[in-house]
Interface confidence: low
């Protein structure tokens, strides 16, 4: 079943999923200048077995110039930046996703991948959040948000997660600022597709904040 | 998928003591918050106990708290529920049930969150 909506926007956050869930699809999207090839996979599926879980179907992205030119595409400033595929070395993750049943690691890169990742996520899928450089994490639980099945519908919990700046002033207990509502936006802002984003490795995250390949802003 | 059995019941004077064991199958156990209920004659099926995943964490409901504790075997896909000084009002059907949520944190006591279920044993608390 797959969930209706996003994950939960926390202001000043970002979430990555450590393992997919069988059924969850990646679509197949090409950076500017490039397309998938004719007769190319829509989409990656996230299958298993008794065994082991993989994904299924391959992305393959061609130039989209003409034929008969030998013009490179120039790639956008922010399609230059390295993909980092990576998992994020942090606390957050719970396990070694490798070793978790039932669930397909994040598929490796394909070349001239768009920048974004979007994928449409299934329900008991968790993704995680930190926050991004320069503001810290506030905890008042889990920094996780989980897609649930409950009486017929899918919701996204609301993680329990405040980013602060560095340099904002500490505000006296019973003083803290409105958080999002905890079924997350209106109905009318749902949207099947849920993009998740490059993690960085935090002492990496500094360098991409100017170029932002977050397709939501965090503001 | 995860499949449940829980074996174990039957019947006990009150004071007494039973142990019941719950028997997962299915690949992704270990991922999986474990919970106990009930269902007494009559009554709605109720929350009795829960485990978290990583087996770091049990909640119970406040009538069996002192008296019942919740564990788990990862290595044996096995769940258990200790008895002692049982009381006749914990007469009832337990169910052994898996959250729906691969490594939740949330640890619910609220039986729709819980997406497998065994067939239940019986338990009778009399003299």
């Known amino acids: 079943e797959l969930c209706d909506d996003d994950p939960p926007e926390i202001p000043h956050a970002t979430f990555k999923a450590m393992a997919y869930k069988e059924g969850t699809m990646l679509n197949c999207e090409c950076k500017r200048g490039f397309r998938r090839i004719k007769s190319g996979s829509l989409y990656m599926l996230c299958t298993g077995n008794s065994s082991h879980s993989s994904w299924d179907n391959q992305c393959q992205c061609t130039s989209s110039a003409t034929r008969n030119t030998t013009k490179q595409v120039t790639p956008q400033p922010e399609e230059q930046k390295e993909r980092k595929t990576t998992e994020m070395q942090s606390p957050m993750q719970p396990v070694d996703q490798a070793s978790l049943p039932g669930h397909c690691r994040e598929p490796p890169p394909w070349e001239n991948e768009a920048t974004e990742r979007i994928y449409h996520f299934v329900v008991g899928q968790m993704v995680y959040y930190q926050c991004v450089q320069g503001y810290r994490a506030l905890h008042r639980g889990p920094a996780e948000s989980v897609c649930k099945m409950t009486h017929g519908k899918t919701r996204w919990t609301q993680p329990q997660l405040i980013c602060t700046g560095e340099m904002e002033t500490s505000q006296f207990p019973g003083e803290e600022k409105p958080q999002a509502s905890p079924e997350g936006r209106p109905e009318s802002e749902t949207s099947c597709l849920v993009t998740t984003t490059d993690f960085q490795i935090q002492t990496e995250m500094a360098a991409t904040m100017e170029t932002s390949i977050f397709t939501t802003e965090y503001q | 998928q995860v499949q449940l059995v829980e074996s174990g019941g039957g019947l006990v004077q009150p004071g007494g003591s039973l142990r019941l064991s719950c028997a997962a199958s299915g690949r992704t156990f270990e991922t999986h918050n474990m919970g106990w209920f009930r269902r007494a004659p009559g009554k709605e099926r109720e929350f009795v106990a829960v485990?978290?995943?990583?087996?770091?964490?049990?909640e119970y409901t406040d009538s069996v708290k002192g008296r019942f504790t919740i564990s788990r075997d990862n290595d044996k896909n096995m769940v258990y529920l200790q008895m002692n000084s049982l009381k006749p009002e914990d007469t009832g059907v337990y169910y052994c049930a898996a959250d729906n949520i691969p490594l939740s944190s949330d640890m619910s006591p609220t039986a729709a969150e819980y997406g497998y279920w065994g067939q239940g044993t019986q338990v009778t608390v009399s003299s």
């Open positions: 485990i978290s995943w990583n087996v770091d964490s049990t």
